[in-house]
């Protein structure tokens, strides 16, 4: 339950907050879960703990893994888990789904796009904003504090927006980028019984033991902005948050995309360090809205190594 997905790019700063909260005066100990090795608090280290925050300055792909934080309140030791994934920088412009933060919707009256996670960093204005990798220019775009305001929003303003800022730590500067999709509300919409595009019903997904696996639940719900539409994953009929396996997490926030004018939602299920017991679980992709609920079931199977028989 007290587990949080965090992700970043190599050579950028990444700061992660312990999912268990406490007063600033409380001691927080951080450990690398796989080895139970304590994370140092000395700032001279590239990866160090600072109270409730775990800082990667800068992050490296090898930092990926599950980190344990223990908040020592006067009464209890509260444990949380930060599931950190550091990705290699993409050479092309496309920002993959797994690097996207939750989608925001805007309309003519309200078109604020907040820069995700920025509150964790020591940054100074102004932010730089990009849309589909192009720097935003023109009087319609205004970078204000930690958000972007777009004047006279049009349908064409939908897309992926990236904020870029500099985190300063003891005089050293580190770059941070974060991307989220922006959709424009369409008043002339309609809603349908959910249609799950992926996975196929009773799909068998091959995975490798010890590797990471991603399952994407993707469904469409109609045209335009949808109310009360959601996609989610269940394990053996239980919500991911209640299942209690920190290695298995849903992507934070749902990515909204418009396919042929349809409003669709994705939810990525990330399984870290696939284990044998994961093959025994039933993975259900659920899509629901006011019309009802549709469920597609997936099971995992072990990917067989390629035979080298003559």
């Amino acid at each position: 339950k007290f587990s949080k997905q965090s992700w970043g790019l190599e050579n950028e700063a990444l700061i992660v907050r312990c999912p268990r909260q406490g007063k600033p005066s409380y001691t927080v100990d951080w450990y690398y879960s796989q080895t139970n090795k304590s994370i140092p608090t000395q700032e001279r280290n590239r990866v160090f703990a600072s109270g409730q925050l775990l800082k990667f300055l800068p992050a490296a792909v090898a930092d990926s893994g599950i980190y344990t934080c223990i908040v020592r309140s006067p009464t209890f030791n509260r444990t949380g888990y930060a599931n950190v994934t550091i990705y290699k920088k993409q050479s092309d412009c496309n920002v993959p789904d797994y690097l996207m933060y939750s989608t925001v919707s805007g309309s003519e009256k309200n078109s604020k796009i907040y820069c995700p996670t920025i509150d964790l960093y020591n940054w100074t204005a102004p932010l730089e904003w990009f849309k589909n990798c192009q720097a935003l220019q023109g009087s319609r775009y205004r970078a204000h504090k930690s958000f972007l305001v777009i004047d006279n929003v049009m349908t064409e303003d939908a897309g992926d927006y990236t904020c870029k800022f500099i985190h300063n730590e003891n005089g050293a500067n580190y770059s941070v980028t974060a991307t989220r999709s922006f959709t424009v509300k369409d008043e002339q919409g309609f809603s349908l019984f959910p249609v799950i595009g992926a996975p196929a019903q009773n799909e068998i997904k091959e995975v490798e033991i010890g590797k990471n696996a991603n399952l994407t639940c993707s469904a469409c719900f109609g045209k335009g902005t949808q109310f009360l539409a959601a996609v989610l994953w269940q394990l053996n009929g239980t919500k991911i948050t209640d299942f209690g396996e920190p290695r298995i997490q849903q992507e934070e926030g749902q990515n909204q995309s418009f396919s042929n004018g349809l409003a669709c939602l994705d939810m990525v299920l990330r399984i870290a360090d696939v284990k044998e017991e994961d093959l025994l679980l039933q993975y259900d992709c659920l899509a629901l809205n006011l019309h009802g609920l549709r469920r597609h079931t997936v099971r995992l199977s072990r990917k067989n190594p390629i035979d080298h028989h003559s």
């Epitope: 339950k1 007290f2 909260q21 406490g22 007063k23 600033p24 005066s25 309140s73 006067p74 009464t75 209890f76 509260r78």
Partner: antibody
């Protein structure tokens, strides 16, 4: 809104046990620890112990250790405090209070209405 | 255990008066919380983290202090402020309260 509703008044004989319930609503039960405080007639407030409903972990005031049991039922969002080997000095109002201490601190902002326990032969 | 000594144990003041209650801890604490309790009612949190005003509490109530010495103040006493006031520390186990200060209106 956050509400803590406690069970009704109890009259017990010395040596018996009493179990007081505290039903929570208006927030995610497992997100906050539940604390128990008692107040003898005309006296001050005395902390008895606490439970983390998420994990079932408990912490007690040494004074009550061995006599008090705290449990939490996640399915009904209810916390329980059981005090055994009752004596006359356990006559008091027993309160549950929610404790969630973070930057937007609302620890001990919400209290149950209290349960009067009378121990008398 | 950290002992909390509140003073005075009782006091009587007039409407409009400035009232101060002190709480001394037997060893240093990070924060002090203050509660108001009226007969037959559960305690009501007024001040938390030494000086932060709880939601919906009038601004005439305030708190200050650090280390072992803390102060609770009512800047202008109102008739509805007649009650017993408690300080409480939550810096170490067990959580402890002061013995209370009974405030009467003259």
């Amino acid at each position: 809104q956050v509400q803590l509703v406690q069970s009704g008044a109890e009259v017990k004989k010395p040596g018996a046990s009493v179990k007081v319930s505290c039903k929570a609503s208006g927030y995610t039960f497992t997100d906050s620890e539940m604390y128990w405080v008692r107040q003898a007639p005309g006296q001050g407030l005395e902390w008895m112990g606490a439970i983390d409903p998420e994990t079932g972990d408990t912490a007690f005031n040494q004074k009550f250790k061995g006599r008090v049991t705290m449990t939490a039922d996640k399915s009904t969002s209810t916390a329980y405090m059981e005090l055994s080997s009752l004596r006359s000095e356990d006559t008091a109002v027993y309160y549950c209070t929610r404790a969630f201490d973070n930057d937007n601190d609302d620890a001990f902002a919400y209290w149950g209405q209290g349960t009067m326990v009378t121990v008398s032969s | 255990d950290i002992q909390m000594t509140q003073s005075p144990s009782s006091l009587s003041a007039s409407v409009g008066d400035r009232v101060t209650i002190t709480c001394s801890a037997s060893s240093s604490v990070n924060y002090m919380h203050w509660y108001q309790q009226k007969p037959g009612k559960a305690p009501k949190r007024l001040i938390y983290d030494t000086s932060k005003l709880a939601s919906g509490v009038p601004s005439r109530f305030s708190g200050s202090g650090s280390g072992t010495d803390y102060t609770f103040t009512i800047s202008s006493l109102q008739p509805e402020d007649a009650a017993t006031y408690y300080c409480q520390q939550w810096s170490s186990n067990p959580l402890t309260f002061g013995q209370g200060t009974k405030l009467e209106i003259k």
